[in-house]
């Protein structure tokens, strides 16, 4: 009996036309939502003038439906048993699942000012930037609508730069009508234990953002894993959002709509400093902000963001070192709300429920030559927003799953 089930599973999880896996893989049958909480800065003037702690108040959720578009350019390669594809991006605002509208205003760090002062370290260039910042009446902080902040706005300071620069700024700009990839993943035809594992991303096996093993593209995209998952496994996956591969470890057995699943979580060790977790040495890219690689819980992804000083963390700086959150008031990290988990059905390796949580932060540093940053006495890793991307298998799909997979085994 078990052998027959294994044979059936192996056949059905292959990523090729006609299998259950392929149908759900091309276009997810699960509704995926991305909730945003924006960190509204309460004391912009005090920060700018006196280098005070930044007082933030989170506002949200603002919810978008995402990942509703089918994979594009799906191409099988029989020679190396891979399938390549693009994952299109799309987001639709869901007013009924949100606390307000896309027109709601927030006081946030001025993204362009913080980024430009970081990218252009030359003092003379900073003086040029300063005159443009003043001319455009820009400051260290700005008021922006949710729509502008997420999806883009024309920045008045960058619009004055007399040579060609992108004048549109947004945390997720450009998003709609763009695609992530090309991904090339193993289809599992020749070896089911490699199914969904990424072979190349954007035509490469490495990212070119990190040194050594940190630069590797490991595992799947976390939507599924090779079948027959064991609790002892460390599940590797790659997330383009954070420009790196990461891993999850087994935490507990969970019953999801009558389906036994394994809950895998991202452990605090994955965010530790190289002092605590030597494997993380290559995620420490500079010595000053990281306090000689002793800070933890924040990931500098500037190399992946055209030099813009973007730092990724868990929401509310969960699992981050005290020095990171010390200059920020109003954060309340807790594991239940702020960690990432994957609920995996172990026989098929399918992720039936997940909550991917991350926080987008921007570094802002004092600058002698930029007036609005002149009074800062320290560096700040400023939280801009955090997001919770969730998906849960629908009731209908769960019934089908129970009858066709778990029911057969039990």
């Amino acid at each position: 009996g078990d052998l027959l089930i294994q044979k059936t599973i192996k056949k059905q999880v292959v990523l090729e036309e006609g299998t259950i896996a392929f149908k759900n893989w091309v276009k997810t049958g699960t509704e995926v939502y991305r909730q945003f909480w924006i960190f509204d800065v309460q004391n912009p003037q005090e920060v700018m003038m006196n280098s005070s702690n930044i007082q933030v108040k989170q506002r949200g959720p603002y919810t978008y439906r995402v990942r509703f578009l089918a994979k594009e350019n799906v191409t099988q390669d029989a020679e190396d048993n891979t399938v390549s594809f693009l994952q299109p991006n799309g987001a639709i605002f869901e007013p009924s699942l949100s606390v307000g509208t896309e027109a709601d205003n927030f006081t946030v760090l001025n993204l362009a000012v913080a980024a430009a002062s970081h990218i252009y370290q030359n003092q003379f260039v900073q003086m040029i930037l300063n005159s443009l910042i003043n001319k455009s009446k820009s400051s260290m902080f700005q008021v922006r609508t949710l729509r502008e902040l997420l999806w883009g706005y024309r920045d008045p300071f960058l619009s004055l730069v007399p040579y060609p620069v992108t004048t549109t700024v947004g945390l997720f700009y450009p998003y709609n009508n763009t695609a992530d990839g090309v991904y090339k993943v193993f289809n599992g035809k020749d070896n089911i234990s490699k199914v969904a594992i990424i072979d190349t991303y954007k035509g490469k096996r490495n990212l070119s953002y990190w040194e050594s093993h940190c630069d590797m593209i490991n595992g799947t995209d976390a939507a599924s894993f090779p079948p027959f998952v064991e609790k002892s496994q460390v599940l590797q996956f790659f997330s383009s959002d954070i420009c790196r591969s990461i891993y999850a470890v087994f935490e507990s057995d969970v019953n999801l709509k009558g389906i036994p699943v394994y809950r895998f979580v991202l452990p605090s060790k994955a965010f530790a400093s190289p002092v605590e977790n030597p494997d993380n040495y290559c995620f420490c890219t500079e010595k000053i902000i990281s306090k000689n690689c002793t800070s933890y819980g924040v990931l500098d992804i500037s190399k992946c963001k055209e030099g813009r000083p973007v730092y990724i963390s868990l929401p509310h700086f969960l699992y981050a070192s005290p020095d990171v959150s010390e200059p920020i008031d109003g954060l309340n990290p807790n594991e239940e709300e702020h960690r990432t988990y994957l609920d995996i059905e172990p026989i098929t390796g399918f992720t039936l429920q997940f909550a991917k949580r991350l926080q987008v932060n921007l570094l802002v540093k004092p600058s002698e030559k930029i007036q609005v940053l002149k009074n800062l006495k320290r560096n700040y890793i400023v939280p801009i927003l955090w997001l919770n991307e969730t998906g849960t298998i629908g009731d209908e799909k769960a019934n089908m799953f129970r009858s066709q997979v778990t029911g057969k085994i039990n």
Partner: antibody
Framework: EVQLVQSGAEVKKPGSSVKVSCKAS????????MQWVRQAPGQGLEWMGG????????AYAQKFQGRVTLTADKSTSTAYMELSSLRSEDTAVYYC????????WGQGTLVTVSS | ETTVTQSPAFMSATPGDKVTISCITS??????MNWYQQKPGEPPKLLIS???TLRPGVPSRFSSSGYGTDFTFTINNIESEDAAYYYC?????????FGQGTKLEIK
Amino acid sequence: EVQLVQSGAEVKKPGSSVKVSCKASGYRFSDYEMQWVRQAPGQGLEWMGGIDPETGGIAYAQKFQGRVTLTADKSTSTAYMELSSLRSEDTAVYYCTRKLDFDYWGQGTLVTVSS
Amino acid sequence: ETTVTQSPAFMSATPGDKVTISCITSTDIDDDMNWYQQKPGEPPKLLISEGNTLRPGVPSRFSSSGYGTDFTFTINNIESEDAAYYYCLQSDNLPLTFGQGTKLEIK
């Protein structure tokens, strides 16, 4: 050693243009911006503008805006200052000088504007 | 624009004297003041850069002080070779602006 060598003296007619060159050596040209300063006979120093060869960032003094053009050629480590619509008041020694603190200077180029 | 008012325009001293030159700026420029010496027929020479920093190779009899808007340049124990024009330059903001210059004559 750091050296800034400027082009030779020029005599120009009013209304014409002049282009002064400044060849840098002894350091990586794109590491530092090049500033331009002029000094009329018996007068003080006057900042005209500066260019950062790395980013192409340029700033001009308001007085010269629209009349001066600064360029930099990284391949030859040479900076240029072109001043157009010359008038007699533009008769001066023109200096290129490195960095914000003007730590090294060219020998100067005398531009005489006379009909 | 930050204007820089330099005084005096002219001063005379004898070897061994101490002289001071003042530069006052119209805006707060922190300590972003530089001082130059220029002799006839030569380009200016940087003596002291931002932060009252004496340049390598410049004799220690030259010094400067000041922060914000008031700056002072001092030559102790003057020597005959110090006869020159002296200029201050603010490098805090654009446009960069010079003082009008001080002519120092050695008797």
